[in-house]
């Protein structure tokens, strides 16, 4: 399930590797899907702190 | 929010088949990935595989051939058929769903599955 | 499979200590930048609660007291000042490669 490229960018990169417009790359089985199929992370409620957000797998401009 | 509710378990005899289901609301199964993982008496989680948003399945290599992963998009619910079950798939069986880094945020609150001659 | 070790299995600590476990991979868990690496804590007849993914973020509404680090093979989760309910049972959880893998546990008694 683990294949596909692997990218040597940093934390802060947009996405780890291209997709189209409107699509994310689906870290966990390594290819592009709708960005509607992927579920992110709870947001944080209002003034709570936490590390800064690092990969966010938005769709490509 | 997303609720998990597991259901199906109970006593089993060595060699028996059972099916647990686990009803989702508040999201659709249709989106992420949706787990099964187990946990025996007194021991630590173990992860049994997923189904996600597309209908692939992926499983622990070490209980692939006796359990399978199905979903009904239908009624939100989606499964765990577990065969020639052994005593030590003697568990509590927790259904869970992740986000995309994999980490499961929301779970359900488990189904014990005995199995005993 | 990754293997995951915690350490150590079991600790005895009062109210108001600074907890440390650790979770060491047999290989890196970390890709495109990312720390596949997470913290459940569980306590005795409930389902575990996601307290840290990716090494470091907090998971929503758990208190500023959890925190994780590290990177490739090493993690750390620390409780700064342990309270009454955090006595429970704490696990890592890799998801970098298939099979998703668990640490054994590391149980946090009362002294």
């Known amino acids: 399930m683990r294949r596909g490229p692997r990218s040597l960018r940093g934390r802060d990169a947009p996405a780890p590797t291209p997709c189209v417009p409107a699509e994310c790359f689906d870290l966990l089985v390594r290819h592009c899907v709708a960005c509607g199929l992927l579920r992110t992370p709870r947001p944080k409620p209002a003034g709570a702190s936490s590390p800064a957000p690092r990969t966010a797998l938005q769709p490509q401009e | 929010e997303v609720q998990l509710v597991e259901s199906g378990g109970g006593l089993v005899q060595p060699g028996g088949s059972l099916r647990l289901s686990c009803a989702a609301s508040?999201?659709?199964?249709?989106?992420?990935?949706w787990n099964w993982v187990r946990q025996a008496p007194g021991k630590g989680l173990e992860w049994v595989g997923y189904?996600?948003?597309?209908?692939?399945?992926y499983y622990n290599p070490s209980l692939k051939s006796r359990f399978t992963i199905s979903r009904d998009t239908s009624k939100n619910t989606f499964y765990l058929q577990m065969n020639s079950l052994r005593a030590e798939d003697t568990a509590v069986y927790y259904c869970?769903?992740?986000?995309?880094?994999?980490?499961?945020?929301?779970w359900g609150q488990g189904t014990l599955v005995t199995v005993s001659s | 499979d990754i293997q995951m070790t915690q350490s150590p299995s079991s600790l005895s600590a009062s109210v108001g200590d600074r907890v440390t476990i650790t979770c060491r991979a047999s290989?890196?868990?970390?890709?495109?930048?990312?720390?596949?690496m997470h913290w459940y804590q569980q306590k005795p007849g409930k389902a575990p609660k996601l307290l840290i993914y990716?090494?470091?973020d907090l998971e929503s509404g758990v208190p500023s007291r959890f925190s994780g680090s590290g990177s490739g093979t090493d993690f750390t989760l620390t409780i700064s000042s342990l309270q009454p309910e955090d006595f429970a049972t704490y696990y890592c959880?890799?998801?970098?490669?298939?099979?998703?893998?668990f640490g054994q546990g590391t149980k946090v008694e009362i002294k």
């Open positions: 990716r090494a470091s």
């Open positions: 189904i996600n948003y597309s209908g692939t399945t």
């Open positions: 290989e890196s868990v970390d890709d495109y930048g990312i720390s596949f």
């Open positions: 869970a769903t992740n986000h995309l880094y994999g980490a499961m945020d929301y």
């Open positions: 508040g999201d659709s199964i249709t989106r992420g990935y």
């Open positions: 959880q890799q998801t970098s490669k298939d099979p998703w893998t």
